[in-house]
C-alpha cells in the first residue's frame, strides 16, 4: 500500500493576513485565525512529518479584501509560490478582472500548475492563452505519480468576467476524456480538483470513471468527522464518501473557506491505484499554531502599500450620502440606492441577446449600512470612507428566488416597522409600496420588478411562481436579520465580490456621483 496526504484549501478569497473567527478583519491577535503565515507553519510541519504530501487549492483565491483590490492577483502568485502549492484549479473569481487580469498576474507568474479541463479558449484568445493553464497535471510524488485534473463552474460567465472567447463546458463531459488520457499514460491515482460546488463534486465522484478523490470548492462546504472545533456546522462527514456508478467508494472533500482551515486527507492506495482507505479532518488554523516569521515579515512588507491606498481618492460625491440609521432603517436612503446601483452594475453580463442583463434586482438590509459620507470634504470618497459604511467584510452574492419568497422578504422588511431594526430593505430594480396600517405579514400592497428579458427595461408586477435572480449581501443569503425565508427557499446561491470593492469600483468608474431618493420605496394608506 502507498499513502498520500492531501492538504487543501479553497475559497481563500484574499485572506492573506490572519482574520477574526468570522473571517473578518483581525482585531484581537491572540484569537485570530488563518492567514498564509500560519498556514505555512502547519504545511511545513506536515511536510516534515509525512513522506508523500500534496498541497492543492480548489480556486477562488481572488477577490475578498483590499489585498486583491490593490495587488490584483500578484499577491496570490507570490504567496502561493512561497508556500509551494503543488496545483490550483481555476475558480470563477479568478476571472473577476477579465482574462488579462488572470493571465498577467497569476498564470504567467505561478510556479505551480493551474488547471481546468472544462475551459476551452476560442478565437484570438486561443493562441494567447494556450498552455498558460492545463487540463491536467501529472505530479511525481515519492516513487509514484499522481494525476490532478481541474474543473471550473460552468456558471462562471454569469458570475464573473471571462469574456466571450472562453467556453465553459459541462464538467463531467469535459473531465472524462482527460481522465481517460491519464489512464492511457498509466497514471492510476487521479484527483479531481475543482471549483463547481459540493453538489457537482459529488456528481463528479459518482459519474467520472477513474477519479479516485474529489477536492472541491465554491460552496464553502464544511465537512467534519467528530466534534467541530469552531462555529462552522458540518454539512457531512470528512471525507464525504460517494459510491460511484461503477461501485467504488470515492472520498469528496472541501475545507470551508477564507483560509480558516487546512484540509487534511490521508489516502491509502493499493498497487493498482485503488483507494483502500481515506480519513482525516480539516485543521483549524487557530492561534495555537504560530505564524511563520519569514512569511509574516513578507506580509508586513506587502501591507505598506495597502495602508497608502486606503486614503487615496476613488471619486467624488456632490451630494450628501445619507447612510444614517435614521434614514436607511425607515425609508429609502440614497446611500442604499448607491450601493444597490453599484451591485447591479457589478453584475452586468450580456450573455444572451434576449436579455439586456441576467439580473436587475438588488435588496440590501438597511442595518448593513453603517455610516453616511459627508460631501463637504471636497466631495472626496476614499476606501477608508467606504470601510466605515460597509465594515463587515461581506460579499454581494447572486441568488435565485421565487417571487413568493421575495414577497415574504418584503413583508419581513416592515413586519415590525418603526423600531429602527436592520431588516428594512433598500432596493434597486424594485418598486415597493407598503401600507403600514395593515397587519404585519400583509403590508406589501405593490411590488414591481424591473424586467430582464426586454430591450427597454420597465417595471412589471412580481409573479409569485416565477424564478428571479437577485443580488444581495451574503448576510441576507445566509438568513441574517431574520430573513430565514431567503436561506430556506433560495434555489441557487453563488458568492460574489467583496462589498467595498463593488462600491469602490463603481465610484471610480462613475468619477462623480449624485444618488437621489427617487421613489423606489413608498408608503401609502387606504385602498388599492
Amino acid at each position: 500500500a502507498w499513502e498520500l496526504t492531501i492538504l487543501h484549501t479553497n475559497d481563500v478569497h484574499s485572506r492573506l493576513e490572519q482574520t477574526s473567527e468570522d473571517s473578518s478583519k483581525c482585531v484581537n491577535a491572540s484569537r485570530c485565525m488563518g492567514g498564509v503565515a500560519r498556514l505555512f507553519t502547519k504545511v511545513q510541519q506536515i511536510r516534515r512529518a509525512e513522506p508523500n504530501v500534496l498541497l492543492l487549492d480548489a480556486g477562488d483565491q481572488y477577490q475578498g479584501t483590499i489585498w486583491f483590490t490593490v495587488y490584483k492577483g500578484a499577491e496570490v502568485a507570490h504567496f502561493m509560490n512561497a508556500l509551494r502549492y503543488d496545483a490550483m484549479a481555476l475558480g470563477n473569481h479568478e476571472f473577476d478582472n477579465g482574462v488579462e487580469g488572470l493571465i498577467e498576474p497569476l498564470l504567467k507568474e505561478a510556479k505551480f500548475p493551474i488547471l481546468s479541463a472544462n475551459i476551452k479558449a476560442k478565437g484570438p484568445l486561443a493562441s494567447q492563452i494556450s498552455g498558460l493553464y492545463l487540463p491536467y497535471k501529472v505530479l511525481p510524488v515519492g516513487d509514484e505519480v499522481v494525476g490532478i485534473v481541474g474543473y471550473t463552474s460552468k456558471e462562471t460567465p454569469f458570475l464573473s468576467n471571462p469574456g466571450t472567447n472562453l467556453v465553459f463546458e459541462d464538467e463531467i463531459t469535459a473531465l472524462q476524456p482527460e481522465v481517460d488520457k491519464l489512464k492511457t499514460l498509466n497514471v492510476n491515482k487521479i484527483i479531481a480538483l475543482g471549483h463547481s460546488g459540493f453538489e457537482m463534486d459529488k456528481l463528479i465522484a459518482q459519474k467520472v470513471r477513474g477519479v479516485d478523490v474529489v477536492v472541491g470548492g465554491h460552496s464553502n462546504t464544511f465537512l467534519y468527522t467528530g466534534n467541530p472545533p469552531s462555529k462552522e456546522v458540518p454539512a457531512g462527514k470528512y471525507p464525504f464518501i460517494v459510491t460511484s456508478d461503477d461501485g467504488r467508494k470515492v472520498p469528496v472533500v472541501q475545507a470551508y473557506a477564507f483560509g480558516k482551515y487546512l484540509g487534511y486527507l490521508k489516502i491509502e492506495f493499493d498497487e493498482r491505484g485503488n483507494v483502500i482507505s481515506s480519513h482525516g479532518n480539516p485543521i483549524l488554523l487557530n492561534s495555537s499554531i504560530p505564524e511563520d516569521p519569514s512569511i509574516k515579515a513578507d506580509i508586513n512588507k506587502w501591507r505598506i502599500k495597502l495602508d497608502n491606498y486606503s486614503t487615496q481618492e476613488l471619486g467624488k460625491t456632490i451630494v450628501y450620502l445619507d447612510g444614517s440609521s435614521q434614514s436607511c432603517r425607515f425609508r429609502e436612503c440614497n446611500m442604499g440606492n448607491l450601493i444597490c446601483d453599484a451591485m447591479i452594475n457589478n453584475n452586468l453580463r450580456h450573455t444572451d441577446e434576449m436579455f439586456w442583463n441576467h439580473v436587475s434586482m438588488c435588496i440590501l438590509n438597511g442595518g448593513g449600512i453603517r455610516s453616511p459620507i459627508d460631501e463637504r470634504n471636497n466631495g472626496t470618497i476614499t476606501w477608508e470612507n467606504l470601510a466605515a459604511v460597509l465594515p463587515f467584510g461581506g460579499t454581494f452574492d447572486l441568488v435565485q428566488l421565487k417571487g413568493s419568497t421575495l414577497k415574504k422578504a418584503f413583508e419581513h422588511s416592515v413586519h415590525r416597522y418603526g423600531q429602527s431594526t436592520g431588516e428594512f430593505l433598500q432596493v434597486g430594480g424594485i418598486h415597493v409600496v407598503y401600507d403600514l396600517s395593515r397587519k404585519p405579514g400583509d403590508r406589501v400592497v405593490k411590488l414591481d420588478v424591473l424586467c430582464t428579458k426586454c430591450r427597454v427595461p420597465s417595471y412589471d408586477p412580481l409573479k409569485m411562481d416565477e424564478v428571479y435572480k437577485v443580488i444581495l449581501p451574503n448576510f441576507l443569503a445566509n438568513g441574517g436579520d431574520g430573513f430565514q425565508m431567503i436561506k430556506d427557499e433560495l434555489l441557487r446561491h453563488d458568492s460574489g465580490d467583496q462589498d467595498i470593492n463593488v462600491v469602490s469600483t463603481y465610484i471610480s468608474k462613475m468619477k462623480v456621483i449624485y444618488p437621489a431618493v427617487e421613489g423606489r420605496i413608498k408608503f401609502s394608506t387606504g385602498s388599492h
Epitope: D86, K108, A110, K111, L139
Partner: nanobody
C-alpha cells in the same frame, strides 16, 4: 502562448561535439524544470537529461553521463545540451520539454512534462 523550440541539431562525425539549444516563450523559463529527451528511429522516446528551475540540480540517463551536460540561462530563457564524444547510437531526434511544477527536483519521467518542442535531428556518422 507557451512554446518550446529546439535548435542546433545536425550531422556530425563520431567523437565530435554539438550544442543543442532550447528556447521557451510565453512564461518565464524560470517557472519550469527542463528536460531533454530523444527518440531514435523505431524506438520509444527516452530520457536524456533534466535540470531544475534554479539550475542547481541536474539529472542524467546512465547512457550519457560524463558526455552530455545540461545547463540553463534563465535570463535568456534558454536551456542547452552540450554533447561531447558523440557516438552513432546518439543518433535521434532530440526534444526539449518543460515541466511546470513548484519543485526544484527535475524528473526523468516523460509524463510529467507539459510542453514539448518539435524536435531537432542529430545524426552521428561513424
Amino acid at each position: 502562448q507557451v512554446q518550446v523550440q529546439e535548435s542546433g541539431g545536425g550531422l556530425v562525425q563520431a567523437g565530435d561535439s554539438l550544442r543543442l539549444s532550447c528556447a521557451a516563450s510565453g512564461r518565464s523559463i524560470s517557472r519550469y524544470n527542463m528536460g531533454w529527451f530523444r527518440q531514435a528511429p523505431g524506438k520509444e522516446r527516452e530520457f536524456v537529461a533534466a535540470i531544475s528551475r534554479s539550475g542547481g540540480v541536474t539529472y542524467y540517463a546512465d547512457s550519457v553521463k560524463g558526455r552530455l551536460t545540461i545547463s540553463r540561462d534563465n535570463a535568456k530563457s534558454a536551456v542547452y545540451l552540450q554533447m561531447n564524444s558523440l557516438k552513432p547510437e546518439d543518433t535521434a531526434v532530440y526534444y526539449c520539454a518543460a515541466d511546470w511544477r513548484n519543485s526544484d527536483s527535475p524528473s526523468p519521467l516523460i509524463i510529467v512534462y507539459d510542453y514539448w518542442g518539435q524536435g531537432t535531428q542529430v545524426t552521428v556518422s561513424s
